[in-house]
């Protein structure tokens, strides 16, 4: 199943990134399994996942550094709290969980650069 | 004449960007002219040039936003005053001048990125 | 040493053809792009065709689109711009340049000039109404 995401993405000065991930779906699933992976230093990491409803929210657990909304086959995700060190690929995995067939698609990444903001000047 | 430069960099937070563009030299130049070109938007355009002799200071003109040294066959490349605008490809060309023959030598560019910081909140 | 030779330039009627040829010596690097620009009096040089001796890969700038055509004979070490329907705003020097193969389809943009070189003498060509 083809996945298909930004191949670059800056984050804000905040350390916010916003990426858009979009699948085409073989079928009619109901049931959606998003995950993030972040690959940098050899190393594959899950950042967060999330498993949705057709037509419901996108819900990461609570502690997650991940938001998203879901629109047909578009995943809208966003990653908070990135520092210049979370630089690296962030691959979007996409898994057709109900009903059967299952499907799995993996997208090509999305390479995030973060960079950390100069501290503001303390106020006397 | 091979020009080899880093395919990505990132401006720091303060605007400044900096990369090394390395020529294999044909020849014993003396005299050695390096332009940054800076690519965006369907369009070239000339952000800097420095002539030099070997062996001498890479000087650019006062009002110049490019700083840079020289070392052999290597030139050390600043870039400041960058804003999230500024983010395109940055191309390093190489001419060298004198003695004769003349050589061109064009980098495949940077792609530098930059993020304009949030503004410090105002100190009451 | 590259060197470039444009020639094929002169006069004719709005509506007619000229050939223009650019022999290319001293080539040592390969693949390599090979341009043909313009520059009228005071304006800058712009591009008008590129042409990738790697795969014969061209690109046209779109005021000559459908007009203009870029091709080359390896054997001859020759670049030709083949202009037909030629009109008076092509009135002006043609140059031919080389470059590196990545920014050949960068030729047609503006400031495209910048990242070609070795530039020859040029040729002139004169459209009048």
């Known amino acids: 199943m083809h996945v298909a995401q930004p191949a670059v993405v800056l984050a804000s000065s905040r350390g916010i990134a916003s990426f858009v991930c979009e699948y085409a779906s073989p079928g009619k699933a109901t049931e959606v399994r998003v995950t993030v992976l972040r690959q940098a230093d050899s190393q594959v990491t899950e950042v967060c996942a999330a498993t949705y409803m057709m037509g419901n929210e996108l819900t990461f657990l609570d502690d997650s550094i991940c938001t998203g909304t879901s629109s047909g086959n578009q995943v809208n995700l966003t990653i908070q709290g990135l520092r210049a060190m979370d630089t690296g690929l962030y691959i979007c995995k996409v898994e057709l969980m109900y009903p059967p067939p299952y499907y799995l698609g993996i997208g090509n990444g999305t390479q995030i650069y973060v960079i950390d903001p100069e501290p503001c000047p303390d106020s006397d | 004449m091979h020009v080899a430069q880093p395919a990505v960099v990132l401006a720091s937070s303060r605007g400044i960007a900096s990369f090394v563009c390395e020529y294999a030299s044909p020849g014993k130049a003396t005299e050695v002219r390096v332009t940054v070109l800076r690519q965006a938007d369907s369009q070239v355009t000339e952000v800097c040039a420095a002539t030099y002799m070997m062996g001498n200071e890479l000087t650019f003109l006062d009002d110049s936003i490019c700083t840079g040294t020289s070392s052999g066959n290597q030139v050390n490349l600043t870039i400041q005053g960058l804003r999230a605008m500024d983010t395109g490809l940055y191309i390093c060309k190489v001419e060298l001048m004198y003695p004769p023959p003349y050589y061109l030598g064009i980098g495949n560019g940077t792609q530098i990125y930059v993020i304009d910081p949030e503004p410090c909140p105002d100190s009451d | 040493q590259v060197q470039l030779q444009e020639s094929g330039g002169g006069s004719v009627q709005a509506g007619g053809t000229l050939r223009l040829s650019c022999a290319v010596s001293?080539?040592?690097?390969?693949?390599?792009?090979m341009g043909w620009f313009r520059q009228a009096p005071g304006k800058e040089r712009e591009g008008v065709a590129a042409i990738y001796n790697g795969g014969g890969s061209t690109a046209y700038a779109d005021s000559v689109k459908g007009r203009f055509t870029i091709s080359q004979d390896n054997a001859k070490n020759t670049v030709y711009l083949q202009m037909n329907s030629l009109k008076p705003e092509d009135t002006a020097m043609y140059y031919c340049g080389a470059g590196s193969p990545r920014f050949c389809a960068s030729a047609t943009m503006t400031g495209g000039h910048h990242l070609f070189g070795y530039w020859g003498q040029g040729t002139q060509v004169t459209v009048s109404s």
């Open positions: 001293g080539v040592t690097y390969s693949p390599h792009c």
